[in-house]
Amino acid sequence: AGHLEQPQISSTKTLSKTARLECVVSGITISATSVYWYRERPGEVIQFLVSISYDGTVRKESGIPSGKFEVDRIPETSTSTLTIHNVEKQDIATYYCALWEV
C-alpha cells in the first residue's frame, strides 16, 4: 500500500509570492497513481483543489482560477508538488495530499 508524507510542517510566505508544498509517496510507484490535493481553511469544510493522474492528466476544482494552483510530480524523487501562485490571505489553510491507487 502507498504511504504519503508531507515533510513541511508549515510554510510561511509573503503576500503575492509563490508557495510550493511537497508530498512524498512511498510504497508505490508515483507514476502508477493519482495524487489529489485538498485544502482546509480555518472553520471551513475541506475542499478539493487539483489532481494529477497516472497519465499526467490534471484536473482542477471548478471555479478555481486556472493560474492559481499548479500540480506536478517528479518520479525521480517520488514527489508531488503543489504550487500556489500569488499567495494571498485567503490561501491560509492546511493543505493535504491524498493518493488513489490505480
Epitope: S53, D55, G56, T57, V58, R59, K60, E61, S62, P65, S66, G67, E70
Partner: nanobody, 125 residues
C-alpha cells in the same frame, strides 16, 4: 459562451506537413486548457494532443509523438497543431476543444466544455 473556429486542414501527401489553427472568442482564453482530438471515418473520436492553461505542459498521443507539436498564443487567443511527417492513418476530421477544468490525455469527451466544428485533414498520394 466560447466559439472555436479551426482552420488549416486540407489534402497533403504522405510525409508532408500541415499547421492547424484554432481561434477562440467569447471568453478569457487562458481560462481554458486546450485539446486537439480527431475522428477518422467510421471510428470514434480520439485524443491527439493537449496543452495546459498556461502552455507550460503539453501532452501527446503515442501515435503522434515526435511528429505533432501543440502550442498556444494566449495573446492571440489561438492554439496550434503543427503536423509533420503525415501518414495516411492521420486522415481524419480534427477538432479543437476547450476545457475549464481538465488538461491531458485522460480528459473525457464530456469534460470539454466547447468544441469547434472540425477541419478535415486528408493524407493521400
Amino acid at each position: 459562451e466560447v466559439q472555436l473556429v479551426e482552420s488549416g486542414g486540407g489534402v497533403v501527401q504522405p510525409g508532408g506537413s500541415l499547421r492547424l489553427s484554432c481561434a477562440a472568442s467569447g471568453s478569457t482564453f487562458s481560462d481554458f486548457a486546450m485539446g486537439w482530438l480527431r475522428q477518422a471515418p467510421g471510428k470514434g473520436r480520439e485524443f491527439v494532443a493537449a496543452i495546459s492553461w498556461t502552455g507550460g505542459r503539453t501532452y501527446y498521443a503515442d501515435s503522434v509523438k515526435g511528429r505533432f507539436t501543440i502550442s498556444r498564443d494566449n495573446s492571440k487567443n489561438t492554439v496550434y497543431l503543427q503536423m509533420n511527417s503525415l501518414r495516411a492513418e492521420d486522415t481524419a476530421v480534427y477538432y479543437c476543444a476547450a476545457s475549464r477544468d481538465c488538461s491531458g490525455p485522460g480528459c473525457r469527451v464530456h469534460e470539454y466544455d466547447y468544441w469547434g466544428q472540425g477541419t478535415l485533414v486528408t493524407v493521400s498520394s
